[in-house]
C-alpha cells in the first residue's frame, strides 16, 4: 500500500436547503482505472462512513440509490455533493480516495472539510 496526497477545502457552509458541495482532488501517481471514493465524518471522537462510490476513470460516480451523496468526476477531481444536512450534521467531512486497479494500491486521506449546517428559521405566519 502506498500513500497519496488528497486535497479538499478547509471549510464549506451548507446552503439553507441543507446541501453542501466540495471538490476532492487527488494526486494520482499512475494511471488508475478503478477508483473508490469514500466520505467519512469525524465528530465526537467517532468516524462514520457517510457514503462511498467506486467508479471507472472516465465514467460517472455511482452512489447507492438511498445515498445522501452525489458526485461527478473529472480527471483527478471528484465533485461531491451531500444533501439532506441538518445542524446536527455539522462536522469534519473527510475525503478518502483509494486507487483500486491496477496495482499497486494507493490510499489517500484528505485533511477534512468542516461543513457547517444552520437549520433555517421557520417563516413567521403571514396574514396575507
Amino acid at each position: 500500500c502506498k500513500a497519496m496526497h488528497v486535497a479538499q477545502p478547509a471549510v464549506v457552509l451548507a446552503s439553507s436547503r441543507g446541501i453542501a458541495s466540495f471538490v476532492c482532488e487527488y494526486a494520482s501517481p499512475g494511471k488508475a482505472t478503478e477508483v473508490r471514493v469514500t466520505v467519512l465524518r469525524q465528530a465526537d471522537s467517532q468516524v462514520t462512513e457517510v457514503c462511498a462510490a467506486t467508479y471507472m476513470m472516465g465514467n460517472e460516480l455511482t452512489f447507492l440509490d438511498d445515498s445522501i451523496c452525489t458526485g461527478t468526476s473529472s480527471g483527478n477531481q471528484v465533485n461531491l455533493t451531500i444533501q439532506g444536512l441538518r445542524a446536527m450534521d455539522t462536522g469534519l467531512y473527510i475525503c478518502k480516495v483509494e486507487l483500486m486497479y491496477p496495482p499497486p494500491y494507493y490510499l489517500g486521506i484528505g485533511n477534512g472539510t468542516q461543513i457547517y449546517v444552520i437549520d433555517p428559521e421557520p417563516c413567521p405566519d403571514s396574514d396575507f
Partner: nanobody, 126 residues
Amino acid sequence: EVQLVESGGGLVQPGGSLRLSCAASGGTLDYWSIGWFRQAPGKEREEVSCISGTGLRTNYADSVKGRFTISRDNSKNTVILQMNSLRAEDTAVYYCTGKLLHPSLWSACANEYDLWGQGTQVTVSS
C-alpha cells in the same frame, strides 16, 4: 462514550505465545491510533507498540521487535497484539490506549493518548 477493554492475558511459559485484544465498547476504533503499553512491578510504564489510524504504520519498542505484532481487525472492531517468544521480562500489566487524531495524522501514531483500558495481566513463568 468509547471505552477500551483488553483481554487475552494470562500465564504462559517462556517461549510461548499470547494474543491480546483491545476492543471498544460504546463506539468504534475506526481510524483511531491505538497503542499498547505495559507496566511491570516497580518499573515505569513503557510503550510496547502502536498502530496508526489507517493501519499503515506500526511501531515497536526495541525490546519486542521481531516478537510482537500489532494489527487491526476492523470487522471485529479490535486491535490485536500478537506476542510470540515470550520472556520472563515481558511479565507486566498490558494496557490498550487510544486517540482519534485529526485526519492529517491518521497515518501516524499518537504522541499521547486520551483513553486507557483497565489492563490485562501477562505473566511469563515456568
